[in-house]
């Protein structure tokens, strides 16, 4: 398996980190904009595909690494290209909040994709 050997972050740990970086925040990464993504098309890799383009923002790095570890676990994860809205850009904080909402829903319903 190409995945790292340390157990990947759990959904709960990802939720905790997303809560941590969004609470009481109006903006993240100096208001950087990223492509909007369809999180239903493999949420970890889809979110990573957009967020990987954010640099010089320590607040988001742990999230990026968590998503990378989770995306790396998926079969042929590197080959799947998620649906991305190339015409829609949103703020990093909005994408992170969207991801948090989506991941919470997945966690509640036990659908650990």
């Amino acid at each position: 398996s190409p995945s790292p050997v340390t157990p990947s972050p759990t959904l709960k740990e990802l939720i905790e980190e997303l809560v941590n970086i969004t609470q009481n925040q109006a903006s993240l990464c100096n208001g950087s904009m990223v492509w909007s993504v369809n999180l239903t098309a493999g949420m970890y890799c889809a979110a990573l595909e957009s967020l990987i383009n954010v640099s010089d923002c320590s607040a988001i790095q742990r999230t990026q690494r968590m998503l990378k570890a989770l995306c790396s676990q998926k079969p042929a994860a590197g080959q799947i290209s998620s649906e991305r809205s190339r015409d829609t850009k949103i703020e990093v904080i909005q994408l992170v909040k969207n991801l948090l909402t989506y991941v919470r829903g997945v966690y509640r319903h036990g659908n650990f994709r």
Epitope: S3, I52, S55, C71
Partner: antibody, heavy 118, light 107 residues
Framework: EVQLQQSGPELVKPGASVKVSCKTS????????IYWVRQSHESLEWIGYI???????TYNQNFKDKATLTVDKSSSTAFMHLNSLTSEDSAVYFC????????????WGQGTSVTVSS | DIVLTQSQKFMSTSVGDRVSITCKAS??????VAWFQQKPGQSPKALIY???NRYTGVPDHFTGSGSGTDFTLTISNVQSEDLADYFC?????????FGAGTKLELK
Amino acid sequence: EVQLQQSGPELVKPGASVKVSCKTSGYSFTDYPIYWVRQSHESLEWIGYIDPYNGGTTYNQNFKDKATLTVDKSSSTAFMHLNSLTSEDSAVYFCATAVVATDVMENWGQGTSVTVSS
Amino acid sequence: DIVLTQSQKFMSTSVGDRVSITCKASQNVRNAVAWFQQKPGQSPKALIYLASNRYTGVPDHFTGSGSGTDFTLTISNVQSEDLADYFCLQHWNYPLTFGAGTKLELK
């Protein structure tokens, strides 16, 4: 200025273990992971990283039984313990950190040469 | 694991030339490729991240390009201090993997 200072060269016997240290300065130690990379015969291999914030580690499968990564937050120092050494483990080991782009190591230690020989 | 192939182990050049070093990924890594320069007895030096972004202080005659599986580091107007080993790194997926390197040498 971000700086990483590694411990000196090691000459060890087969079967022994060694602990390489990496003392950091110039930034907040818990903000960024410490990455470890091995260079032998010119090629570079990523060993893994440790996040000093929570002690979380991610290893390359190839090094899961060879390397153990730890940190001492009080001295802003990272350590890599290498066990059951063989001649194949003779290499230069680097620590590094990534500040600008996640997982792209732009600040490197000077390297620690580990030679395994009887 | 994602394999990065730097097909040319050695490249010969002359001062003032333009040279392109290539790196091919075994699968789609989007734009998550970085480039490093290493001189004998020194640590690697990061030049480029996310395929085309230069680190502060890196001369602008170093240019990165590409996405997906094919990436290029172009050095225009090669200087003698550019003679070194160049490695690519993919930072899309764990484990992070490096190319085997390309040594830039004088003709």
